[in-house]
Amino acid sequence: SSCGQVKCRKGEQCVHTASGPRCFCPSPRDCESGCASSPCQHGGSCHPQRQPPYYSCQCAPPFSGSRCELYTAPPSTPPATCLSQYCADKARDGVCDEACNSHACQWDGGDCSLTMENPWANCSSPLPCWDYINNQCDELCNTVECLFDNFECQGNSKTCKYDKYCADHFKDNHCDQGCNSEECGWDGLDCAADQPENLAEGTLVIVVLMPPEQLLQDARSFLRALGTLLHTNLRIKRDSQGELMVYPYYGEKSAAMKKQRMTRRSLPGEQEQEVAGSKVFLEIDNRQCVQDSDHCFKNTDAAAALLASHAIQGTLSYPLVSVVSESLTPERTQ
């Protein structure tokens, strides 16, 4: 019904009030619900109302506003501090001290975060997203720069139904449809062999405390474990000769290690350099990820940061020491 200049929507009635004509909904059942457009943001719940705008939002803290669009920092949150002297002494010694494993302490100077002092450096969310790894979806952190809220907005709890079987048959050049799902790592792309690759830009350079021969022997499990964390597929990069880019790693010459070597006399015939682990170059292949998800890494920067985030949480199943994202394609760098 029309009411002077005011046009009322279907099911609404025109009411003349002291402040002029107004539309009114006598029975919300018969009117277009204001909630139909999902106006309440950040997990707020929507309740239909009889008067414009025909909805009200009940916001989840720390959000407010008519559409829960406003973020209000809790006033009681004290500024994060670092146990200054203790953590200053312990930072960058290669050992993760939980008491220093905080944003304020740069994750123990990188000791807890694969040497990356701020995995959330590119995250511009008003929320401190490192504090919102809480098994619930925080949409303000659900961006690639904020590491997809640790994948908590897309049913993170889904587990691979036939995990043992799928682990044993991962990337074995035989398609097992029961394993061809995101939570099972898409069977290591065994079911997508005929599809073109979809490589993310860049290379993940990972140092892991396993000698090259052991890592190559365990490569399928290693790639599956990291792929599961990143919700995509990984492969070992090949050099210009077609060789897998897995190299012996001899360890950083940290102050602690130099000191240790000085106090330990070399025995005759003892090798000057011991292999401490491997340096492995990995590529991300999103060919399946892009079909099933909009949470895929276009480049390796955020993927490296997400691995660092898992290190902070202590959820890595391999002894990774460091992770770096390289945007160029380097020939073997030691």
Epitope: G94, C96, G314
Partner: antibody, heavy 122, light 107 residues
């Protein structure tokens, strides 16, 4: 099978020195931190020292700082505890124990050796 | 340093009893707490880590709970092989510290 075997304990006079060894097998020695924990006769457990073999980083209890030195030889998969200026109160069974979380001192000790007895007495 | 205080120091119980041991920390160590079992002349054995997670091979009658400063180890139905001394340990910050132990004896 993951195994830790201590050796080197014995009787020593106050002010003397002793070196304990802990031979590790069945896992990647470089990847996991190792602690020494001691237990005086009839008493409770006391943490002594920690080392992360990969980086060589070390931690000590105040009671032994400056007297004890922890080290690791990654080529031999062995951790050591060099004990100098020994006192009667250092008398204890010394255990080496592996930490469960790779490079984290903030992790529980999931594998223990059988212990070696150190007696400091004149 | 974080002081760990266990109670009771000792207790007598019968096979089949439900036993509860508590451990209080002088400051919060979040959930970075372990429980160990030690039998005479033997090395300690890890039972619980992360305050509530059972170590591999540990029977389900052992359970842990708590966070912050107050923690509990519960043995739901005491078995003959459970008579031993139990220690709590915080591993949140160095120096790592143990409780003084709780001896569980046969009544």
């Amino acid at each position: 099978e993951v195994q830790l075997v201590e050796s080197g304990g014995g009787l020593v006079q106050p002010g003397g020195s002793l070196r304990l060894s802990c031979a590790a097998s069945g896992y990647s020695f470089t990847s996991y931190g190792m602690s020494w924990v001691r237990q005086a006769p009839g008493k409770g457990l006391e943490w002594v020292s920690y080392i992360y073999p990969y980086s060589g980083a070390t931690y000590y209890a105040d009671s032994v700082k400056g007297r004890f030195t922890i080290s690791a030889d990654t080529s031999k998969n062995t951790a050591y505890l060099q004990m100098n200026s020994l006192r009667a109160e250092d008398t204890a069974v010394y255990y080496c124990a592996r930490h469960s979380g790779y490079y984290r001192i903030s992790s529980a000790m999931d594998v223990w050796g059988q212990g070696t007895l150190v007696t400091v007495s004149s | 340093d974080i002081q760990m205080t266990q109670s009771p120091s000792s207790l007598s119980a019968s096979v089949g009893d439900r036993v509860t041991i508590t451990c209080r920390a002088s400051q919060s160590n979040r959930r970075f707490l372990a429980w160990y079992q030690q039998k005479p002349g033997k090395a300690p054995k890890l039972l619980i880590y992360g305050a509530s997670r059972r170590a591999s091979g540990v029977p389900s009658r052992f359970s842990g709970s708590g966070s912050g400063t107050d923690f509990t180890l519960t043995i739901s139905s005491l078995q003959p092989e459970d008579f031993a001394t139990y220690y709590c340990q915080q591993y949140y910050i160095s120096p790592l510290t143990f409780g003084q132990g709780t001896k569980v004896e046969i009544k």
